[in-house]
């Protein structure tokens, strides 16, 4: 018996087609992805093949103005329209709190939403009961397939799930659910979840009875043969893991942003054992037409977005200096504003010993593309912020050693004076440079804000200590020459859309007046 698994993950509100780098579509003839194009391909496959499941491994939420405005309603609507069969909860599904998950998505989705390792307690338990499930048995033709979900246990540090959801260890939580499926005579089981490729592989290895793992969170691109676009494969598709009980378990993921549709064909024997598995992600490029009906629906929903872009988010009573003349040479108040917003967006009081889990922010000055003039009645709009942060990036959480941070700050000024983008703006950091010294030895003082303290204060950076830092995904991926960050980071979790982070902060503060205050000397 043959099953076709179509899968997406980390779509991050890319409902419309995008450029090849998943930013805003500029030249339509070269654009990719989007739900209208995805639907065309899914329908093509559904028509051609008998047993097809369309699955999503989480993080549909967060990433573009679509999510900012529609807050998840767009996810439910278009996933219903595409007739998804199941979805796993990702960490970003909790970005607007549990209510922001329940009302727009859990109550509106026609498909089951899954996670076996999230347990509700207290008053939430009855409120959320039945709205998400640990597993679901899906009929496919004359057979049944069990889908069991999982979500990153780091979610409390990455999002806003509140205090009434407990995120258990994935493997510990999955095993009893898989065992239950076995007792129900379900012998074909897919683990669908959002914990990253390393955990996906561990699940394949450790959870007895899981036949296939469909993952997300790490934006992993797997491919067999010559890859069709810019993404470099982390391994073959499917990635085969030998389980502890000797089975070959295919593990798949489909990069991110709806650029690819994962396509995996699995052949099972009559006892539910995987005989063979093969496939590849399908690049959703312009050779695949956008479905006109879904496209028309997208255009209808788009109208509200255009209106939102020009509405006032808040006011500034000072000039927001985002000029390259400032932000690539010295501390600029736009950099301070953005870094303050980045830290504010990551306030998570999960431990009494820590005022917060992260206190530091770094931001490449070259990523700040425009100032905002306060003389327009002080008004700040989404449109204004899109000029400051036009690349559609995210502000991510990483863990770095102090020694890596030191290298990053040396790189920040290694060719100072040439108006290059690598000059770092900061938050929760005091850095002193001596530009008379030779490149690689210009950082003379580097103090960082403590986290394990009740009164935050600045202490000297310790080379061997591990620090959490918020930074643009561009830097986490080694952009602007920050190869040391990419090479030496100990953990990387993708965060919220850059503009959304700043706009939320401005809306919260209502009136802002960021200063230049001696963070960089």
């Amino acid at each position: 018996w043959e099953l076709t698994i179509l899968h997406t993950n980390d779509v991050h509100s890319r409902l419309e087609q995008t450029s090849e780098d998943s930013s805003k579509c500029v030249n339509a003839s070269r654009c990719m992805g989007g739900v209208a194009r995805l639907f065309t391909k899914v329908q093509q496959i559904r028509r051609a093949e008998p047993n097809v499941l369309l699955l999503d491994a989480g993080d549909q939420y967060q990433g573009t103005i679509w999510f900012t405005v529609y807050k998840g309603a767009e996810v439910a609507h278009f996933m219903n329209a595409l007739r998804y069969d199941a979805m796993a909860l990702g960490n970003h599904e909790f970005d607007n709190g549990v209510e922001g998950l329940i009302e727009p998505l859990l109550k509106e989705a026609k498909f089951p939403i899954l996670s076996a390792n999230i347990k509700a307690k207290g008053p939430l338990a009855s409120q959320i009961s039945g709205l998400y499930l640990p597993y679901k048995v899906l009929p496919v033709g004359d057979e049944v397939v069990g889908i069991v979900g999982y979500t990153s246990k780091e979610t409390p540090f990455l999002s806003n799930p509140g205090t009434n959801l407990v995120f258990e260890d994935e493997i510990t939580a999955l095993q009893p659910e898989v065992d239950k499926l076995k007792t129900l005579n379900v012998n074909k089981i897919i683990a669908l979840g959002h914990s990253g490729f390393e955990m996906d592989k561990l699940i394949a290895q450790k959870v007895r009875g899981v036949d296939v793992v469909v993952g997300g969170h790490s934006n992993t691109f797997l491919y067999t043969g010559n890859p069709p676009s810019k993404e470099v494969p982390a391994g073959k598709y499917p990635f085969i893991v030998t389980s502890d009980d000797g089975r070959k378990v295919p593990v798949v993921q489909a990069y991110a942003f709806g650029k690819y549709l994962g396509y995996l064909k699995i052949e099972f024997d009559e006892r539910g054992n995987v005989i063979s598995s093969h496939g590849n992600p399908i690049l959703l490029n312009s050779s695949i037409p956008e479905d006109p009906s879904i496209k028309a629906d997208i255009n209808k929903w788009r109208i509200k977005l255009d209106n939102y872009s020009t509405q006032e988010l808040g006011k500034t009573i000072v000039y927001l200096d985002g000029s390259s003349q400032s932000c690539r040479f010295r501390e600029c108040n736009m950099g301070n504003l953005i870094c303050d917003a980045m830290i504010n967006n990551n306030l998570r009081h999960t431990d009494e010993m820590f005022w917060n889990h992260v206190s530091m922010c770094i931001l490449n000055g070259g990523g700040i593309r425009s100032p905002i003039d306060e003389r327009n009645n002080g008004t700040i709009t989404w449109e204004n912020l899109a000029a400051v942060l036009p690349f559609g990036g995210t502000f991510d959480l990483v863990q770095l050693k102090g020694s890596t941070l030191k290298k990053a700050f040396e790189h920040s000024v290694h060719r100072y004076g040439q108006s290059t983008g690598e000059f770092l703006q900061v938050g929760g950091i005091h850095v002193v440079y001596d530009l008379s010294r030779k490149p690689g030895d210009r950082v003379v003082k580097l103090d960082v804000l403590c986290t394990k303290c009740r009164v935050p204060s600045y202490d000297p950076l310790k080379m061997d200590e591990v620090y959490k830092v918020i930074l643009p995904n561009f830097l986490a991926n080694g952009g602007d020459g920050f190869q040391m960050i990419k090479d030496e980071l100990l953990r990387h979790d993708s965060g919220d859309q850059d503009i959304n982070v700043v706009s939320t902060y401005i809306s919260k503060m209502k009136v802002i007046y960021p200063a230049v205050e001696g963070r960089i000397k």
């Epitope: 028509r47 007739r83 899906l138 009929p139 049944v144 009906s293």
Partner: antibody, heavy 121, light 107 residues
Framework: QVQLVESGGGVVQPGRSLRLSCASS????????MHWVRQAPGKGLEWVAV????????YYPDSVKGRFTISRDNSKNTLYLQMNSLRAEDTAVYYC??????????????WGQGTMVTVSS | DIQMTQSPSSLSASVGDRVTITCRAS??????LAWYQQKPEKAPKSLIY???SLQSGVPSRFSGSGSGTDFTLTISSLQPEDFATYYC?????????FGGGTKVEIK
């Protein structure tokens, strides 16, 4: 082979009740949504009810809502339609039809031969 | 509710003719449309689903097209066994609704 066979039709007085059955064979009944569709003499097709594969949801058009109840017994591979408060306009051939394997609305790939229900005094 | 309007309600054609039947939905239904053939005193038979997919065992002279609100069933070369009534049906949302039917008669 895949087959649906309806039974239980007949002549009934207005206001009375009737229960139709549909026996299935040749496929995994519990995996499919099942529907009733009717056709009044000389008229077109009208959808009457659906029950999802696991019995979790049922849907009806306004014309029969509150009067007709669809049910299924997966252990017997049988679909039912309980029709109460019957009216003259319910006179039709009633077909049972197989839908899809999910909770989304679907088309019908297999049809029974139909059973005639006549509501008349 | 979504109304389905079929046209024409009847047509006369000869064996070998190309026949086109249209179906219009009162609102967008994407490609969630099916076509059925019904002969007198018989149950309907599924021809096409998802607007353009041929049900297995259905001759290739039948084809469907369309998306959104406007759909077409085409019989490329009418055969004697094709004289029947044809219905479209939307399954975008409940309640499921059928077109009024198109009767294809011998000229």
């Amino acid at each position: 082979q895949v087959q649906l066979v309806e039974s239980g039709g007949g002549v009934v007085q207005p206001g009375r009740s009737l229960r139709l059955s549909c026996a299935s064979s040749g496929f995994t009944f519990s995996n499919y949504g099942m529907h009733w569709v009717r056709q009044a003499p000389g008229k077109g097709l009208e959808w009457v009810a659906v029950i999802l594969y696991d019995g979790s949801n049922k849907y009806y058009p306004d014309s029969v809502k509150g009067r007709f109840t669809i049910s299924r017994d997966n252990s017997k591979n049988t679909l039912y339609l309980q029709m109460n408060s019957l009216r003259a306009e319910d006179t039709a051939v009633y077909y049972c039809a197989r839908g899809g394997s999910s909770w989304y609305p679907d088309s019908f790939d297999i049809w029974g031969q139909g059973t005639m229900v006549t509501v008349s005094s | 509710d979504i109304q389905m309007t079929q046209s024409p309600s009847s047509l006369s054609a000869s064996v070998g003719d190309r026949v086109t039947i249209t179906c219009r939905a009162s609102q967008g239904i994407s490609s969630w449309l099916a076509w059925y053939q019904q002969k007198p005193e018989k149950a309907p038979k599924s021809l096409i689903y998802a607007a353009s997919s041929l049900q297995s065992g259905v001759p290739s002279r039948f084809s469907g097209s369309g998306s959104g609100t406007d759909f077409t069933l085409t019989i490329s070369s009418l055969q004697p066994e094709d004289f029947a009534t044809y219905y479209c049906q939307q399954y975008n949302s409940y309640p499921l609704t059928f077109g009024g039917g198109t009767k294809v008669e011998i000229k």
